[in-house]
Amino acid sequence: NQDLPVIKCVLINHKNNDSSVGKSSSYPMVSESPEDLGCALRPQSSGTVYEAAAVEVDVSASITLQVLVDAPGNISCLWVFKHSSLNCQPHFDLQNRGVVSMVILKMTETQAGEYLLFIQSEATNYTILFTVSIRNTLLYTLRRPYFRKMENQDALVCISESVPEPIVEWVLCDSQGESCKEESPAVVKKEEKVLHELFGTDIRCCARNELGRECTRLFTIDLNQTPQTTLPQLFLKVGEPLWIRCKAVHVNHGFGLTWELENKALEEGNYFEMSTYSTNRTMIRILFAFVSSVARNDTGYYTCSSSKHPSQSALVTIVEKGFINATNSSEDYEIDQYEEFCFSVRFKAYPQIRCTWTFSRKSFPCEQKGLDNGYSISKFCNHKHQPGEYIFHAENDDAQFTKMFTLNIRRKPQVLAEASASQASCFSDGYPLPSWTWKKCSDKSPNCTEEITEGVWNRKANRKVFGQWVSSSTLNMSEAIKGFLVKCCAYNSLGTSCETILLNSPGPFPFIQDNIS
C-alpha cells in the first residue's frame, strides 16, 4: 500500500458566462475556492479505484473536477465519460504534483453522469471515479418571509421557509417615499434574522436563495401622516401571521396608542408596545397588532387610535387562497408606425405575482407597479412596433392568469409576388388588411387599366405569424391572359402598392414593383 500515490480530488465552482461542452484542461475562469471531494479508496473493487464524493451541480453552472497526484515521475491519463474517451493533458504545479482537470461549462442533463479518470504512473495504475448530477431544483422553494415576535424580547424575527436555506436580510429606510427605493443611500441592509430597531419609517425583510429574492414589508400606519381618505388594505391567507405596526411621534410622552378591530379593543395577547425618545427629544411610540395565524374572522377594519393624533384604519382581508383579479378578455390595438404605445394590464393579486410578457416565443422581463387604489399595473412598451400577438402571463402560489393582446401597425401594403405555370399570387401584410385588384396590360390598355375579375381568389389572413395577418390574392392562369403582363395591386386606407408579373415567360418570373401612394 505504501506504493499508492497520495491523491487529492477537488471541485472548483466557476462564475462564468461561457457555454461549451466538457473540456479536459486547466481552463482559465473566475473561480470560487476549491472544495475537497475527499477521494477515498473504494473497497472490494478490482484494481485500485478511488471514489470522489458525489458532486451536485446547478443547471448551467460551470465546474472543474480536478485531481492532484503526489507521485514520482511522469503520469499519463485518460478521461472516459459515457463510453467516450476524452483527451487528458496533465501538468505539474509548483509543488511538483500532477494536476489533471476536467472542465464542464454550462452544466446540462447530458453532462451528468460518471466521469472516470484513468491514471498511469511509473509505479502504478489507478482509476478515479466522479459522479456528477444535476441538483434537483424542483425541490427548491423560495417562500415570502414572515414575521414572528422573539420570545421575551421586543424584537422581530424574519422567517422564510425555503430550500436551500435562504440568506435573510432586513432592509431599513428612514426617509419618506421615493428615497426608500432599493439602491438609495437612505437604505440600510442588515444580514440577520432578528431586528431590534423597529422604529424606522420603512421596514422590509428579504430572503434570497438560488431561486431569487422575495421580500415582505412590515405593514405600517403612521399617525403623523394625514390619514388617506381611502383606507389601505392588507391581504392575508388563512393561517398566515398578521402584523400591523402603528407608529406615532409626539412632542412629549403624554399620549397613548390603542388598536381596535371593528370598534372592539384587541385582546391582550394580540398587541405589544415599544417606545423611545428620538434625537430631538420627541417621543416615538409603536404599537404592533399581531395574530400568529389568521382565520376568516380576523377580517375587518383595524383602527389605531392615539390620544393626540387622528386615528387611522386599515382593512384586513383574509382569503382562503391566493387570487389574481383582472379582465382576461383579449385586446386589439392598432397604432401608427411611430406612435408611442404601451400594453398594460391592471390587476389585483395576493400573494404578489411573478409575470412575463411574451412575443414571438421570446420572453421579456415584467415589471409591476402598485397603484394607490389597491391595484397593480404592468406595462410593456418594448414592442419595437412589431405587429403580432403579445401575451401577458402572471402567476402566484395559487392562481394563474393569461391575457392576449394583438398589435396591428397601420401601414401601406407592401406586395410580394410569385408565379407558377398555372397561377400568379401576390401577398401583402399591410394594415388595415388590404383589398386586391388585378389588371391586364395590353396594347388596348398600356396603362394596365383593364380589370381582371375572372379566376381571382382572395384569401384574407391565410397565415398567422404570431398574430400577424397576411393577405393574399391568387390569379388562375387562363388562355386570355397567357403571355401578358398583369398587375396585382393591394390597397388600404394608407395607400396602394402593386407588382407587375409577366405570365408564362420561360425561366424566373420578372417582377416589377410599383408603389403608388
Epitope: N224, T226, P227, Q228, T229, T230, L231, P232, Q233, Y301, T303, S305, S306, S307, K308, H309, P310, S311, Q312, S313, L315, T317, N373, G374
Partner: antibody, heavy 118, light 111 residues
Framework: QVQLVQSGAEVKKPGASVKVSCKAS????????MHWVRQAPGQRLEWMGF????????KYNEKFKGRVTITRDTSASTAYMELSSLRSEDTAVYYC???????????WGQGTTVTVSS | DIVMTQSPDSLAVSLGERATINCRAS??????????VHWYQQKPGQPPKLLIY???NLESGVPDRFSGSGSGTDFTLTISSLQAEDVAVYYC?????????FGGGTKVEIK
C-alpha cells in the same frame, strides 16, 4: 358630547373676504381632521377642503384654490375658513364637519350663513 | 370630478312602507376592498347627519331601519319602514377621489 359651534351670519360685499370660525368641544381637537363644506341655495353640498389640526396639513378643492385658506388654533380648539374675493355665487351656508377616516363626516357645525351682496 | 347622481329627486311613501333611494357614481368609487360612499340625512334648518358610512355600515345611534348597499358605481339607501321623523332630504357622498362630491339630494315625504 361632541359639539362644533360656528360663528354667526355674515353679510359681505363682492370682492371682500369672510372668515368663519368653528370651535370644537367634547373631544381632543387634534384627533380629528376638520373639513369645510358649503351649501348654496338650491345647490348640492360642495366640499371645500380640510385641515389636520395635529400637523397643520391642509388640502383644498381645486375650485377654491387660491381663494380659500383653512387654519387652526389648537390652544383654542378652533378651526377657521377664510374665503376671499367673494362673489354673489359664494352666498351659501358654510359648515365645518369633523371627519374620521373610518366613517366620514360624523359631526357637523350648525352652519354659518354668508350673504354676498352689493 | 366624480358626479353623484341621485334618483328619484323626491319620493312620497306611506308611513310604515319601504323607501328606496338610489345613487349612481360616474365612475367606480371602490378602492381596495371598500366602497367610499356615505349617506346623510338633512332636515330643514339643520346640518346634515351621517347615517351610513362605507356604503353599508350603520353609524352608531342611527335606527336600524336605515340600511345601505351597493358597490362600484351603484348604491342604495333603504328605509325599511318609514317613520314621520324620517321626512328629510337624503344625500350620498363619495370620498374615493378628491374633490369629495355629493349627490343632488332626494326629498322624502309622507304620502
Amino acid at each position: 358630547q361632541v359639539q362644533l359651534v360656528q360663528s354667526g351670519a355674515e353679510v359681505k360685499k363682492p370682492g371682500a373676504s369672510v372668515k368663519v370660525s368653528c370651535k370644537a368641544s367634547g373631544y381632543t381637537f387634534t384627533r380629528y381632521v376638520m373639513h369645510w363644506v358649503r351649501q348654496a341655495p338650491g345647490q348640492r353640498l360642495e366640499w371645500m377642503g380640510f385641515i389636520n389640526p395635529y400637523n397643520d396639513d391642509t388640502k383644498y378643492n381645486e375650485k377654491f384654490k387660491g381663494r380659500v385658506t383653512i387654519t387652526r388654533d389648537t390652544s383654542a380648539s378652533t378651526a377657521y375658513m377664510e374665503l376671499s374675493s367673494l362673489r354673489s355665487e359664494d352666498t351659501a351656508v358654510y359648515y365645518c364637519a369633523r371627519w374620521r377616516q373610518l366613517g366620514s363626516l360624523d359631526s357637523w357645525g350648525q352652519g354659518t350663513t354668508v350673504t354676498v351682496s352689493s | 370630478d366624480i358626479v353623484m347622481t341621485q334618483s328619484p329627486d323626491s319620493l312620497a311613501v306611506s308611513l310604515g312602507e319601504r323607501a328606496t333611494i338610489n345613487c349612481r357614481a360616474s365612475e367606480s368609487v371602490d378602492t381596495y376592498g371598500s366602497s367610499f360612499v356615505h349617506w346623510y340625512q338633512q332636515k330643514p334648518g339643520q346640518p346634515p347627519k351621517l347615517l351610513i358610512y362605507l356604503a353599508s355600515n350603520l353609524e352608531s345611534g342611527v335606527p336600524d331601519r336605515f340600511s345601505g348597499s351597493g358597490s362600484g358605481t351603484d348604491f342604495t339607501l333603504t328605509i325599511s319602514s318609514l317613520q314621520a321623523e324620517d321626512v328629510a332630504v337624503y344625500y350620498c357622498q363619495q370620498n374615493n377621489e378628491e374633490p369629495w362630491t355629493f349627490g343632488g339630494g332626494t326629498k322624502v315625504e309622507i304620502k
